[in-house]
């Protein structure tokens, strides 16, 4: 495990190759989750922020930026989009949670909740994923598309198998997250593929 506190993955160029694989021993399907991370990009086009595919299932869990001020969450190939007024370009702290029992998905941008949306009520997100930063997977761990690649910096990434209450989302935004049990930036297993550099986080 690597403690990446105070560091970021830098994706310095548009490509169809550069990415980071995040490794988790997740063994059971997800009924709930919360994912939080920081990102900084000056791309105005669409791009993938967090791509989670399972064997034979594309877009099992995908966080995708459609354009400035629009964030999408895919669960089991279904999509909801939430809108926010934001500065561009600017660093952003993103959290998104989803609860199977209600289907409710909620984005939090810089500690502020966006309008709740609903999708895939009763669905379970499959386990044993391939998780990729920097590219959007169209297969299990591959089939990338340059036009959806991420250029910029990502850090402070945590993922829990529960829907965090607002006070814990705010703690993550403020830099004091709870220990995370799917992915934890302080104890991360990862593989860098291509031109991705680890650098100090300087924009928070």
């Amino acid at each position: 495990h690597t403690d990446l506190s105070g560091k970021v993955f830098v994706f310095p160029r548009e490509s169809v190759t550069d990415h980071v694989n995040l490794i988790t021993p997740l063994e059971k399907p997800l009924q709930n989750f919360t994912l939080c991370f920081r990102a900084y990009s000056d791309l105005s086009r669409a791009y993938s922020l967090f791509s989670y595919n399972t064997q034979g299932r594309d877009n099992e869990l995908l966080v995708y930026k459609e354009r400035v001020g629009e964030y999408s969450l895919y669960i089991g190939r279904h999509k909801v989009t939430s809108k926010v007024i934001e500065k561009f370009p600017a660093p952003v702290h993103i959290c998104v949670s989803w609860e199977s029992s209600s289907g409710i998905a909620e984005f939090w941008i810089n500690g502020t909740p966006l309008v709740k949306k609903g999708l895939r009520q009763g669905y379970f997100v499959e386990a044993q994923p391939k998780i990729v930063l920097g590219q959007e997977q169209d297969s299990y761990g591959g089939k990338f598309d340059r036009s959806q690649s991420f250029v910029g910096e990502i850090g402070d990434l945590y993922m829990w198998d529960s829907v965090l209450p607002p006070e814990n989302i705010l703690s993550a935004y403020q830099g004091t997250p709870l220990p995370a049990n799917i992915l934890d930036w302080q104890a991360l297993n990862y593989e860098i593929r291509g031109y991705v550099i680890i650098k100090p986080l300087v924009w928070v």
Epitope: D3, P25, D161, L178, P179, N181, Q186
Partner: antibody, heavy 119, light 107 residues
Amino acid sequence: QVQLVQSGAEVKKPGSSVKVSCKASGYTFTSYWMHWVRQAPGQGLEWIGMIHPNSVNTNYNEKFKSRATLTVDKSTSTAYMELSSLRSEDTAVYYCARRNDYYWYFDVWGQGTLVTVSS
Amino acid sequence: DIQMTQSPSSLSASVGDRVTITCKASQNVNSNVAWYQQKPGKAPKLLIYSASYRYSGVPSRFSGSGSGTDFTLTISSLQPEDFATYYCQQANNYPFTFGQGTKLEIK
């Protein structure tokens, strides 16, 4: 095999400090968080804090933040826990323990170091 | 801090008995609970993590269940080597906290 070997028992005076060592072997020392836990005689377990040997990032239980200092020596794969301003209530067995592969649980423990605080 | 309250604090049982130890958290800890076994003069040993996953090498007679605030450790058929003290631990919030322990004695 993976093991943590701690320093021997210590007897200390109230107000003094103690430094307990924990030497790791059988795994990559710099890849796992090291935790410190104590157990007073006949009592339960109490988490003191943790340190990552590579980044030297630490996280302390607020109760110990002002008195405990966690450090590492990467060259010898050794973790240290220093506790200052000792009082009789600090009499306990102090354990180092490695973070589990899966999550924030402790899968490998040192044998423990008894620290006795007595005037 | 999250309090972890174990019950009973001690119990007597015989070899072959089925034993259940419970742990109640003072607030929701999801499934982020582990169980440890400790014998006198020895360090604790990890038995169960994430509420219900048996750690490698742990006999199948040990099982864990629960989520939220209520957790259970069950030993399906007590063996002589199982007489020890058992602790639960939450890893949902800092600081990590432990139950006060349950001492399992021979009847």
